[in-house]
Amino acid sequence: QQQTLPKPFIWAEPHFMVPKEKQVTICCQGNYGAVEYQLHFEGSLFAVDRPKPPERINKVKFYIPDMNSRMAGQYSCIYRVGELWSEPSNLLDLVVTEMYDTPTLSVHPGPEVISGEKVTFYCRLDTATSMFLLLKEGRSSHVQRGYGKVQAEFPLGPVTTAHRGTYRCFGSYNNHAWSFPSEPVKLLVTGDIENTSLAPEDPTFPADTWGTYLLTTETGLQKDHALWDHTAQNLLR
């Protein structure tokens, strides 16, 4: 006999990175017929939603109108059909950004390099932080961590055309509180014609997601669709 229902899916719209004082929606998708959804934050009950009519709804949205550092952290959700509860969803890491200061991102030997050259990014922030994050626009949400008192270095090693793209960095005050993003640095990698034409970009941040994040930053607009990637949920784990 089944003791629990399948776990729901959880995600943030428009983005799991939320500028402070901006809004975010946390979505939880379970099953039709669920009479109650619960959103948990860092192990404590955060909010409840009882969809009406439950048989016609399989997703609820929890609105956070005013993001701040107290609400940054790990979220999960569960749902109930009758008296039977689901397994908890995966954890959603909600990050507050635009805290305190803006780091400076630079690249050595420069933004235009030849395939095979060793490239290192440097992220500098003079305020009290020791963790830095380097992100590249693209599809798979890979984030590199670096450590240092005021500066972290991110050696990419010998680069290929797959490293081409736009990079930004953040200073991190804790896992879920990040600085303003740095100004972007565009890395151009040239190789021989054959390699260049055959080597596709290997972007490492969800497509269109950075644009959505910037839209949120600049205007506070809320897009009513998911722009997330499963790997983004593992960002801080």
Partner: nanobody, 126 residues
Framework: EVQLVESGGGEVQPGGSLRLSCAAS????????MGWFRQAPGKEREFVAA???????YYADSVKGRFTISRDNAKNTVYLQMSSLRAEDTAVYYC????????????????????WGQGTLVTVKP
Amino acid sequence: EVQLVESGGGEVQPGGSLRLSCAASGRTFASAAMGWFRQAPGKEREFVAAISRSGDTYYADSVKGRFTISRDNAKNTVYLQMSSLRAEDTAVYYCAAVVPTYGNNIYVHSAAYNYWGQGTLVTVKP
């Protein structure tokens, strides 16, 4: 900007009743989820009850069956009817709002609330 003003606190004997009111200014009340929290001397602020825009309610286990939260959108007011009061209910009671929000959202965690009242004192003693 939303302003919340609580009233109705006072001293009552164990087993007695009180009704707290929270009047909200502005035209945003209908789009707000509302909640009551309390803080006893020397203790942390704790959740008491909450109500969604659509009228769904949620209660702390300690007050379930004794307290009732309700709202009157025409009067921009949320109420907390408290009965069978106990000494451990003694606290400053705060009204809070999440503005704006979705219709069925009920918020339990204090961090979710972006507007707070100044509080009203409830004392339960013989």
